[in-house]
């Protein structure tokens, strides 16, 4: 049943005479495996014996005889799936049928394939695209329908009989569907190689030539120009006629159209290849090419630049920056249409010439304010000499110059005073915009670079302003020199270096920190009252008198200073000790007296010891002595004596008289 | 007996100035420091500042610098006062005092237009 | 400078009573504080100076203490006289400062 055997493999196979073949191929039987193959070379069915007739290749059986032809033919397939065969060498007389006779268990197959071997080999095939253009690329392919694995080969391009440096990729295919060989070559050809022959040459793989196959390039081109021109030089004068002819060395196709270029912009009425200019102007210099078309495009000569010679013309200058900083560089530039190109320049500022400016550009390293200005030039070719432009203004910036700080006020300057001080400068450019003060303060500026310093202080030494356009200039610093009264004046014990006591040698000092101006006098008063006019208080013995508050002035032409308050403290022994008595030195007897130990003293009383007339001490020692009831017996002299840390002191004798009372009286 | 007799009381505009006199006698005028106070309607004492009656070097509280200006006439024993700008605000009786024991009657001052 | 702060600033007493002002300086002023007695057409007459020295021909009744910021002066006995407007003052560096005042009235 032939619905049941399906077979795939190439329909013909070719070769050449000692190369080989291989027949890629694949079967389906489905009722069962393989159990018999044959092939045959040319089979014919023999109806009489229902079997084929013809040479047999190759056998296979249940027993495994082989023929001897086995060793040329190989069935490389199995019993289920590949047919793949090999015949290797391959001869002349191998061309025609090959029937592969195959066998299973119930059902049979006569499956034929075409091998055409000739006897030399034969050439590749060489596939061109349809059309071919100049610089664009394309696929060369050289196609060969062969390729077996026991015969290696190879094709090579040449062009022209030459090796072609581009790298060819080639690649094989040995499947059921196709068996071939192919090179495929990347392209760009140009317009040179229109005509030119292309050749694919299969070589075995030695290297030895086999066969080839040879195409001609038909490159499309635009139209390859030639210009010529006379004079040959293109270098004319004005008035002078010039002619150029356009030549077309290649054209594929055939051009259609002439015209011709100047700079790039077609001149009207010129479509013949010869073109004639007569009386030429300057304007009538620039780059010339004619450009001739087909159906490809347009072709374009080189450019041939004509030259009309002329004297410059009047010159300009252009300035390589302005406006320029000080201390910066400036190049100036003549600029001058000439032809030939200006050969000496004379430069100008301000209308004088400069003298040893001879080149094209004036370089000046180092910008200075004088060389602000106009620039103007000359230029001078072998034609004659240009007129001079109206030049360009270099305009040279530069911080102010020469900024001074200048105190407005009559000097001196005193603490407390109102300072005006301004800002000036000497030139600038551009204008001052602003002024900066160092140090800063909370200070007005009233206009500007002017400074107004409310109630200056004594400590405000130096101010430095600065004068501002697109830099800041700092004037030096300027001393205001303020003047003020005498700072920190205090007074300083100088002896004792102890406590003071009564009687002890005193010194007072007094200190101040700084005055200015530095001449000063001295003044020292206790409660508003002025003792001295030294720096120096001295008391050559102290009393308790001289105890108090004390102040020292500094005086100088601004004004005075004053100390704090210094207390003066002075220790001594309790004085002008006395002992007052209450109600009175005369007291009746049963009533109360009180005896007082006043005193002066400092520190104060310490401890009192009372005594009587006897001298006598009293086992009392408060200040205050009280005798309740008085008696008769308490008559007499008392005194009293104070103590405190410096030393002791003892009242004058105070007599106390006590009386009898009436009763006492009426009883004697 | 220490006194110190001050001038009488003044009217004056907005702008102007006004000198006062303190005339001391009972002690030695050279000898003390001379204070000027100045009290404002139902306000406290401010002091204006003081002068050396021997020198005539002068120290001011800052509040009054620019505006009083003291000095002295040894000769006479008289103690000055000038105030200058006068605003309203400068409306008040000013004492002299010498330290603070002895004090002047005042004088008054009133600024109006 | 040194701020001084007096109270109270109105006080009402009768004859014979004992009354006390204070002053507080916003610095130590060591003693160095005055007081003061302002009456109506009478010249203003210094009571104590030195935080605690009576001026000569003021009568005992007047005392004053303190040191550093906190002062007082104390009358002791009130009489008629003594019903005036009160003023403390520092005098240890210049500029010298008063306070604001205490009136004492008749209650």
């Known amino acids: 049943d032939s619905s049941k055997w399906v077979f795939e493999h190439p329909e013909t196979l070719y070769a050449w005479e000692g190369a080989c073949v291989w027949i890629p191929c694949t079967y389906r039987a489905l009722d069962g495996d393989l159990e018999s193959f044959i092939l045959f070379h040319n089979p014919e069915y023999n109806k009489n014996t229902s079997k084929f007739d013809g040479t047999r290749l190759y056998e296979s059986t249940k027993d495994g005889k082989v023929p001897s032809e086995q060793k040329r033919v190989q069935f490389l397939g199995d019993k289920n799936k590949n047919c793949t065969l090999s015949i290797h060498p391959v001869h002349l007389n191998d061309s025609g049928q090959l029937g592969l006779r195959m066998e299973s268990k119930t059902e049979k197959w006569m499956e034929r394939i075409h091998l055409n071997v000739s006897e030399r080999p034969f050439p590749p095939h060489i596939q061109l695209p349809p059309e071919i253009q100049e610089s664009q690329e394309v696929t060369l392919t050289c196609l060969l329908n062969f390729s077996c694995y026991g015969y290696p080969i190879q094709l090579q391009w040449l062009l022209e009989g030459v090796p072609m440096r581009q790298a060819a990729v080639t690649s094989t295919s040995l499947t059921i569907k196709s068996v071939f060989t192919r090179s495929e070559l990347k392209f760009s050809p140009q317009w040179s190689h229109h005509g030119k022959i292309v050749t694919c040459q299969l070589q075995d793989a030695d290297g030895k030539f086999l066969s080839n196959d040879t195409v001609q390039l038909n490159v499309k081109h635009t139209p390859k120009l030639e210009i010529k021109v006379t004079p040959s030089d293109a270098i004319v004068r004005e008035g002078d006629s010039v002619t150029m002819t356009c030549e077309v060395s290649s054209s594929n196709p055939e051009y259609t159209t002439v015209s011709w270029l100047k700079d790039g912009t077609s001149l009207k009425k010129q479509n013949t290849f010869t073109l004639n200019l007569r009386e030429v102007t300057k304007d009538q210099s620039g780059k010339y090419c004619c450009q001739v078309s087909n159906d490809v495009g347009p072709g374009r000569s080189e450019e041939v630049f004509l030259q009309v010679q002329y004297a410059p013309e009047p010159s300009t200058v252009q300035i390589l920056h302005s406006p320029a900083v000080e201390g910066s560089q400036v190049e100036f530039l003549c600029m001058s249409l000439a032809n030939p190109l200006p050969t000496n320049y004379t430069w100008y500022h301000n209308g004088k010439e400069m003298q040893g400016r001879t080149e094209e550009k004036v370089h000046i390293p180092k910008i200075l304010p004088w060389h602000a200005g106009t620039y103007s030039c000359v230029a001078e070719n072998i034609l004659g000499t240009g007129q001079r432009g109206p030049g360009a203004e270099l305009d040279v910036q530069y911080p102010p110059k020469k900024v001074t700080t200048v105190i407005q006020n009559p000097m001196p300057i005193r603490e407390g005073d109102t300072v005006t001080l301004s800002c000036n400068y000497n030139s600038s450019n551009p204008s001052v915009t602003r002024y900066e003060w160092k140090p800063h303060g909370a200070w007005e500026e009233p206009s500007l670079g002017v400074l107004k310093i409310q109630n200056v202080g004594w400590d405000n030494t130096t101010i430095a302003c600065a004068a501002c356009n697109s830099w800041c200039s700092w004037a030096s610093p300027v001393a205001l020199n303020v003047q003020y009264a005498p700072r920190d004046v205090r007074v300083r014990k100088i002896k004792p270096l102890s406590e003071i006591h009564s009687g002890n040698s005193v010194s007072l000092q007094c200190d101040f920190s700084s005055s200015h101006p530095k001449e000063v006098q001295f003044f020292w008063e206790k409660n508003g009252r002025l003792l001295g006019k030294e720096s120096q208080l001295n008391f050559d013995s102290i009393s308790p008198e001289d105890a108090g508050s004390y102040s020292c002035w500094v005086n100088n032409s601004i004004g005075q200073t004053a100390s704090k308050a210094w207390t003066l403290e002075v220790l001594y022994a309790p004085r002008r000790l006395r002992v007052s008595m209450s109600p009175g030195d005369q007291v009746m007897e049963g009533k109360s007296a009180t005896l007082t130990c006043e005193s002066d003293a400092n520190p104060p009383v310490s401890h009192y010891t009372w005594f009587d007339w006897n001298n006598q001490s009293l086992p009392y020692h408060s200040q205050k002595l009280r005798l309740e009831p008085v008696k008769v017996q308490h008559s007499g002299a008392y005194w009293c004596q104070g103590t405190n840390s410096v030393g002791k002191g003892r009242s004058p004798l105070s007599t106390l008289t006590v009386y009898y009372s009436p009763e006492t009286i009426g009883r004697r | 007996e220490v006194q110190l007799q001050q001038s009488g009381p003044v009217l004056v505009k907005p702008g102007a100035s006004v000198k006062m006199s303190c005339k001391a006698s009972?002690?030695?005028?050279?000898?003390?420091?001379m204070n000027w106070v100045k009290q404002s309607h139902g306000k406290s004492l401010e002091w204006i500042g003081i002068?050396?009656?021997?020198?005539?070097?002068?120290s001011y509280n800052q509040k009054f610098k620019g505006k009083a200006t003291l000095t002295v006439d040894k000769s006479s024993s008289t103690a000055y006062m000038e105030l200058n700008s006068l605003t309203s605000e400068d409306s008040a009786v000013y004492y002299c005092?010498?330290?603070?024991?002895?004090w002047g009657q005042g004088t008054s001052v009133t600024v109006s237009s | 400078d040194v701020q001084i702060t007096q109270s109270p600033s109105y006080l009402a007493a009768s004859p014979g009573e004992t009354i006390t002002i204070n002053c507080r300086t916003s610095?130590?002023?060591?003693?160095?504080l005055a007081w003061y007695q302002e009456k109506p057409g009478k010249t203003n007459k210094l009571l104590i100076y030195?935080?605690?020295t009576l001026q000569s021909g003021i009568p005992s009744r007047f005392s004053g203490s303190g040191s550093g910021t906190d002062f007082t002066l104390t009358i002791s006995s009130l009489e008629p006289e003594d019903f005036a407007m009160y003023y403390c003052?520092?005098?240890?560096?210049?500029?010298?400062?008063f306070g604001g005042g205490t009136k004492l009235e008749i209650k």
């Open positions: 610095e130590s002023i060591s003693k160095h």
């Open positions: 030195s935080g605690s």
């Open positions: 003052q520092q005098h240890n560096e210049y500029p010298w400062t």
């Open positions: 009972g002690y030695t005028f050279s000898d003390y420091f």
């Open positions: 002068i050396n009656s021997y020198s005539g070097g002068t």
């Open positions: 005092a010498r330290w603070m024991d002895y």
